[in-house]
């Protein structure tokens, strides 16, 4: 079974003399569900040839997954601590359908895929908490993520083999990016 | 294998623009979490952080420097370069490049150059 | 800025014996810390990071704890090779910095 933020894990160094932060528990939070995600690739890689293949353009264009630009003040030049957290918190409910998608694309992980989709609604909750301004986050539709996740699970296989690394690879670094800057706020 | 190799002048003068290149292998600067940072030494002096490059161009440097300081990459050539304009005498030391990659980001510097020694004097 | 500061800045010991290095943080970087070996005329080499994971293929005689604001280095049956200077990193946030290093020499 997935080991809980909080348990002992391989990136957790030595107890704390005092309770995490906020700010330390989203860090552990985010290192968590990154330990899951590489389980999963490594799942995908070891079924598929899909880690090598060089065709991703190819599925690509059926996806639009969140990524990590300099406008969004997250970058070190023109970084916005309020800006960056608004694009952190709405890329993460952007993911949330695809993440949706992947609940049954793996066998012996199967655990592991909820661990992740579960954990990222957590961090989702702990940094809308640490947001000061709500407003300007857009929840996706419903009715489109329904429509997408159809459109996902239709595919031929190929492409649902090419998603699920899209996907996972994409959440890996958007996730880094996230990362890198909450350390800096 | 990774490796990093930094090149560039030996000897400049004050005022001058210093101007190094890393050429590396055995790794991508277009894989998530991976960066390659500058990092130099005054002859006998501890470590100094000078700048650092991300995968996606996201870039860092010193406060003290950063008016001098540019860092760049060419992702297809294998290459970061960094320059530092208005060279003094206190800036010469060991300068090093070196590799900063893992999946939660520890900043860490796993591999290093074996660094090139700049004096700056007239 | 995170300062980082080391002790002692050196330290004399023989073959076989065990040293404790430390190194404080003025604010907490959680354990976000990395140690270096450099011996003279060489680069630094990485030992730990994240405060307590040994890098790949440094030996088990050394060992790092620590998180918040106070980190050690521990070397156990120390060997000549082992002798160098030792930096801690703040890996918290940017700007990373250095600690003045703490010099060991192996009689």
């Known amino acids: 079974a997935p080991v809980l933020p909080g348990e002992d894990s391989k990136n957790v160094a030595a107890p704390h003399s005092q309770p995490l932060t906020s700010s330390e528990r989203i860090d552990k939070h985010i290192r968590y569900i990154l330990d899951g995600i590489s389980a999963l690739r490594k799942e995908t890689c070891n079924r598929s040839n899909m880690c090598e293949s060089s065709k991703e353009a190819l599925a690509e264009n059926n996806l639009n997954l969140p990524k990590m630009a300099e406008k969004d003040g997250c970058f070190q030049s023109g970084f916005n601590e309020d800006t960056c957290l608004v694009k952190i918190i709405t890329g993460l409910l952007e993911f949330e359908v695809y993440l949706e998608y992947l609940q049954n694309r793996f066998e012996s992980s199967e655990e592991q895929a909820r661990a992740v989709q579960m954990s990222t609604k957590v961090l989702i909750q702990f940094l809308q908490k640490k947001a000061k301004n709500l407003d300007a986050i857009t929840t996706p539709e419903p009715t489109t993520n329904a429509s997408l996740l159809t459109k996902l699970q239709a595919q031929n296989q190929w492409l649902q083999d090419m998603t699920t690394h899209l996907i996972l690879r994409s959440f890996k670094e958007f996730l880094q990016s996230n990362l890198r800057a909450l350390r800096q706020m | 294998q990774v490796t990093l190799k930094e090149s560039g002048p030996t000897l400049v003068k004050p005022t001058q623009t210093l101007t190094l290149t890393c050429s590396f292998s055995?790794?991508?600067?277009?894989?998530?979490?991976?960066?390659v940072g500058w990092v130099r030494q005054p002859p006998g002096k501890a470590l100094e952080w000078l700048a650092f490059?991300?995968?996606?161009?996201?870039?860092y440097y010193s406060p003290s420097l950063e008016s001098r300081l540019t860092i760049t990459k060419d992702t297809s050539k294998n290459q970061v370069v960094l320059t530092m304009t208005n060279m003094d005498p206190v800036d010469t030391a060991t300068y090093y490049c070196?590799?900063?990659?893992?999946?939660?980001?520890?900043?860490?510097?796993?591999?290093w150059g074996q660094g090139t020694l700049v004096t700056v004097s007239s | 800025d995170i300062q980082m500061t080391q002790s002692p800045s050196s330290l004399s010991a023989f073959v076989g014996d065990g040293v404790t290095m430390t190194c404080w943080a003025s604010?907490?970087?959680?354990?976000?810390l990395n140690w270096y070996h450099q011996r003279p005329g060489e680069a630094p080499e990485l030992l730990v990071f994240?405060?307590?994971n040994l890098q790949i293929g440094v030996p088990s005689r050394f060992r790092g704890s620590g998180s918040e604001t106070y980190f050690t280095l521990t070397i156990n049956s120390l060997q000549p090779e082992d002798s160098g200077t030792y930096f801690c990193?703040?890996?918290?946030?940017?700007?990373?910095?250095f600690g003045g290093g703490t010099k060991l020499e192996i009689k």
């Open positions: 070196a590799r900063s990659a893992d999946d939660y980001l520890y900043y860490s510097f796993d591999t």
């Open positions: 055995g790794f991508s600067l277009s894989t998530s979490g991976v960066g």
């Open positions: 490059i991300w995968w996606d161009d996201d870039k």
């Open positions: 604010q907490s970087i959680n354990d976000y």
């Open positions: 994240a405060a307590s």
């Open positions: 990193q703040n890996a918290h946030s940017f700007p990373l910095t």
